[in-house]
């Protein structure tokens, strides 16, 4: 990982700014999609639509597919339902930090972070706290930039996600993602 903190010239797929822009687009699209599937019209989620290029569209489709699979994991849903959202920032950062506490980074965990953020957003919608939505997106992007950005750069940018989940065994990887998030939530409950 380059320690210079400088942005690579030309804003290619591994530049800090490009990774953050794409990450923001993916997160926004993922959350809007999850909310839409709940059937709830959420004007709070009507964030500025940004045209997606073919690569980002592919990535979005990949995230949707994983999200659907995670939605059907009952154990994970039960754990998320039990999350106390009285102090959502504390919960978010503790669970996020725990997911990566062993220093091992992989795309499954990045997706687990997005999925957890989407679930917190949906809870905010259900409890009529719409102002939390942009806030949760902000927390997710902050964590992404400070903890995951260097690793994503090392993978050649977001396109590495497609090859990670582009195998015939992507369902197996999704089970792993659910396991990571469930474990982090379990630890958080014990600590909380």
């Amino acid at each position: 990982m380059d320690g210079s903190g400088e942005q690579p010239r030309g804003g290619g797929p591994t530049s800090s700014e490009q990774i953050m822009k794409t990450g923001a687009l993916l997160l926004q699209g993922f959350i809007q999609d999850r909310a839409g599937r709940m059937g709830g019209e959420a004007p709070e989620l009507a964030l500025d639509p940004v045209p997606q290029d073919a690569s980002t569209k592919k990535l979005s489709e990949c995230l949707k597919r994983i999200g659907d699979e995670l939605d059907s994991n009952m154990e994970l849903q039960r754990m998320i339902a039990a999350v106390d959202t009285d102090s959502p920032r504390e919960v978010f950062f503790r669970v996020a930090a725990d997911m990566f506490s062993d220093g091992n980074f992989n795309w499954g965990r990045v997706v687990a972070l997005f999925y957890f953020a989407s679930k917190l957003v949906l809870k905010a919608l259900c409890t009529k706290v719409p102002e939390l939505i942009r806030t949760i997106m902000g927390w997710t992007l902050d964590f992404l930039r400070e903890r995951l950005l260097g690793w994503i750069q090392d993978q050649g940018g977001w396109d590495g996600l497609l090859s990670y989940f582009g195998t015939p065994t992507w369902q197996t990887v999704t089970i792993f993602v659910a396991g990571v998030l469930t474990a982090s939530l379990t630890i958080w409950k014990k600590m909380g």
């Epitope: 903190g5 953050m20 822009k21 923001a24 400070e146 903890r147």
Partner: antibody
Framework: EVQLVESGGGLVQPGGSLRLSCAAS????????IHWVRQAPGKGLEWVAS????????YYADSVKGRFTISADTSKNTAYLQMNSLRAEDTAVYYC??????????WGQGTLVTVSS | DIQMTQSPSSLSASVGDRVTITCRAS??????VAWYQQKPGKAPKLLIY???SLYSGVPSRFSGSRSGTDFTLTISSLQPEDFATYYC????????????FGQGTKVEIK
């Protein structure tokens, strides 16, 4: 070249207000995070507040919550720290810094804030 | 809140000495720990990020490591320009702080 320049410090009476500015160049603050860190005379570093302008995430230390407000104008590539109800214990050199990979990689030169009657 | 307890608070050493400064986190933290050097009247300078990554332009005599909740900055062979105050820093939201600094270690000439 990445650069951060603070301004706005000075002498103010207890209960007074000041607004500090942090002008950034060489990078876009929209996709970054800007922090204010202060250092009282002869003391260590204390994190004060931070902002991530893209979604407007803001964070504050308990010691300044409700009194200080961090903001940013991305069109000017500048972050601000509005300090109200100032106390003697707020006297310090205030630095703005950019974070990258969880570390503060670029710092300004600092601006001195003195709260005294 | 996560506390970063830095030790020692000061130390005296000679040029060429190996110097070790430790920061202990009060609870399990991620590897988002950084080390800075500060000289009087100047802004801090980043030395190490992500616990053990050497920042660009920093001499290789500086290194960082992690063992559980203990984070260590080592200067393998102290140089005249290394006499300064060193701070550790942790990133990660904890109740009231996004960033937490250690109390600092002043490295003086013996």
């Amino acid at each position: 070249e990445v650069q951060l320049v603070e301004s706005g410090g000075g002498l103010v009476q207890p209960g007074g207000s000041l607004r500090l500015s942090c002008a950034a160049s060489g990078f876009n603050i929209s996709y970054s995070s800007i922090h204010w860190v202060r250092q009282a005379p002869g003391k260590g570093l204390e994190w004060v507040a931070s902002i991530s302008p893209y979604y407007g995430s803001t964070y504050y230390a308990d010691s300044v919550k409700g009194r200080f407000t961090i903001s940013a104008d991305t069109s000017k590539n500048t972050a601000y720290l509005q300090m109200n109800s100032l106390r003697a214990e707020d006297t310090a050199v205030y630095y703005c810094a950019r974070s990258h990979f969880g570390a503060l990689d670029y710092w300004g030169q600092g601006t001195l804030v003195t709260v005294s009657s | 809140d996560i506390q970063m307890t830095q030790s020692p608070s000061s130390l005296s050493a000679s040029v060429g000495d190996r110097v070790t400064i430790t920061c202990r986190a009060s609870q399990s933290v991620s590897s988002a720990v950084a080390w800075y050097q500060q000289k009087p009247g100047k802004a801090p300078k980043l030395l190490i990020y992500s616990a053990s990554s050497l920042y660009s332009g920093v001499p290789s005599r500086f290194s960082g490591s992690r063992s559980g909740t203990d984070f260590t900055l080592t200067i393998s062979s102290l140089q005249p320009e290394d006499f300064a105050t060193y701070y550790c820093q942790q990133w990660g939201y904890s109740h009231s702080h996004l960033i937490t600094f250690g109390q600092g270690t002043k490295v003086e000439i013996k």
